[in-house]
């Protein structure tokens, strides 16, 4: 369970992958597109409004929480719409949603080392959102053995 | 195997440059974070510099922003560390380091090389 | 002065249980994983635990890591001459935007 409805921070940031790929959302045919791709140097980054909420279940990693509590996030790049886990697809998703958002649109956030992050589902424990063919999507992983692919991970700028 | 040999140390008078070189091999190379730690003569560990796996990040210590630069080339599997405006106090032994990607940690060390700053 | 605070000297006989302590802050300890390293006399350092508690592969099960709140320790049981090294404790820091070591701990087997 979610303590609260309400966020208990929210911060404005761009999404790279480990390898430094930028993360961009396109309005195409009235639905959002998400790619992996260089950007040119001059271009600027899209931003992702990150809003955290404190968790009171663990998730299936032995992570670094706060006290205890997981801290979970949803992730905007624009108004209304939320990154959303699809597992049936194994997919991730940009939807139109209104609040209270569905449990689709929320996951545990994994703190590493130089600002890097991981995303894991909270529909779904041990599945993370990764990067497959340029595009963003669900990823099962292996704790024994793939828990640091550098596929889920991802990098948070200001 | 995985290895990594860092070159370049020496004697240097304060005030001058120095550049060191880690060149990696038995990875690949352009898939990993690299960092430099370095450790004076009976001192501990501290950490210096870090570049992201296609170097758009660079990090460095307070203690040597501004006079030292950490870059990489992937094609030639190696990590650099330039090293200007040396101060006595510059004076260690210079690791580089792999962060590991499962264990998010300092998992692969070169055996050093000595840096000292002195007239 | 190190941002990670551990004990300059630990010693016990062979056979003992020995803890090392590492104490930081909630930017550090507090958010993120503990690494420890042991340094033999004259080597580079060895990665023993990584993500606070997790051993690395090839590292004896007589070394485990916790971590509580904005403290963490390593735990030697059965304690041998070879273990004789100095051990260090790192994390990422997310004010400093930097990795920052314990000063170290000369552990010695008498």
């Known amino acids: 369970s979610i303590t609260g409805i309400s966020p208990i921070t929210e911060s404005l940031a761009s999404l790279s992958t480990y390898n430094d790929q930028s993360i961009t959302f396109a309005l195409e045919d009235e639905s959002y597109e998400i790619y992996v791709e260089d950007l040119k140097k001059d271009k600027k980054k899209d931003k992702v409004l990150l809003s955290y909420y404190e968790s009171q279940h663990p998730s299936s990693e032995s992570g670094d929480g706060v006290d205890g509590k997981m801290l979970m996030v949803t992730l905007s790049p624009t108004k209304d719409f939320w990154l959303q886990a699809n597992n049936k697809e194994h997919s991730v998703e940009l939807h139109k949603c209104e609040k209270p958002l569905p449990d689709q649109a929320f996951f545990v956030l994994h703190n590493r080392s130089f600002n890097c992050v991981s995303f894991e589902c909270k529909t779904d424990p041990g599945v993370f959102i990764g990067v497959k063919d340029n595009h963003l999507a669900l990823i099962k992983v292996d704790y024994s053995e793939n828990l640091g692919s550098e596929n889920i991970l991802f990098k948070l700028s200001e | 195997e995985v290895q990594l040999l860092e070159s370049g140390g020496g004697l240097v008078q304060p005030g001058g440059s120095l550049r060191l070189s880690c060149a990696a091999s038995g990875f690949t190379f352009s898939n990993y974070y690299m960092h430099w730690v370095r450790q004076a003569p009976g001192k501990g560990l501290e950490w210096v510099s870090s570049?992201?796996?296609?170097?758009?990040?660079?990090y460095y210590a307070g203690s040597v922003k501004g006079r030292f630069t950490i870059s990489r080339d992937n094609s030639k599997n190696t990590l650099y560390l330039q090293m200007n405006s040396l101060r006595a106090e510059d004076t260690a032994v210079y690791y580089c380091?792999?962060?590991?990607?499962?264990?998010?940690?300092?998992?692969?060390w070169g055996q050093g090389t000595l840096v000292t700053v002195s007239s | 002065q190190s941002v990670l605070t551990q004990p300059p000297s630990a010693s016990g006989t062979p056979g003992q249980r020995v803890t090392i302590s590492c104490s930081g802050s909630s930017s550090n300890i507090g958010h993120n994983a503990v690494w420890w390293y042991q340094q033999l006399p004259g080597t580079a350092p060895k990665l023993l635990i990584?993500?606070?508690?997790m051993r690395r592969m090839g590292v004896p099960d007589r070394f485990s890591g916790s971590k509580s709140g904005t403290s963490a320790s390593l735990a030697i049981s059965g304690l041998r001459s070879e273990d004789e090294a100095d051990y260090y404790c790192?994390?990422?820091?997310?004010?400093?935007?930097?990795?920052?070591f314990g000063g170290g701990t000369k552990l010695t087997v008498l």
């Open positions: 380091a792999r962060l590991g990607l499962r264990h998010d940690a300092f998992d692969i």
């Open positions: 990584y993500a606070s508690n």
């Open positions: 570049i992201s796996s296609r170097s758009s990040h660079q």
């Open positions: 790192a994390a990422w820091d997310d004010s400093q935007k930097a990795v920052v």
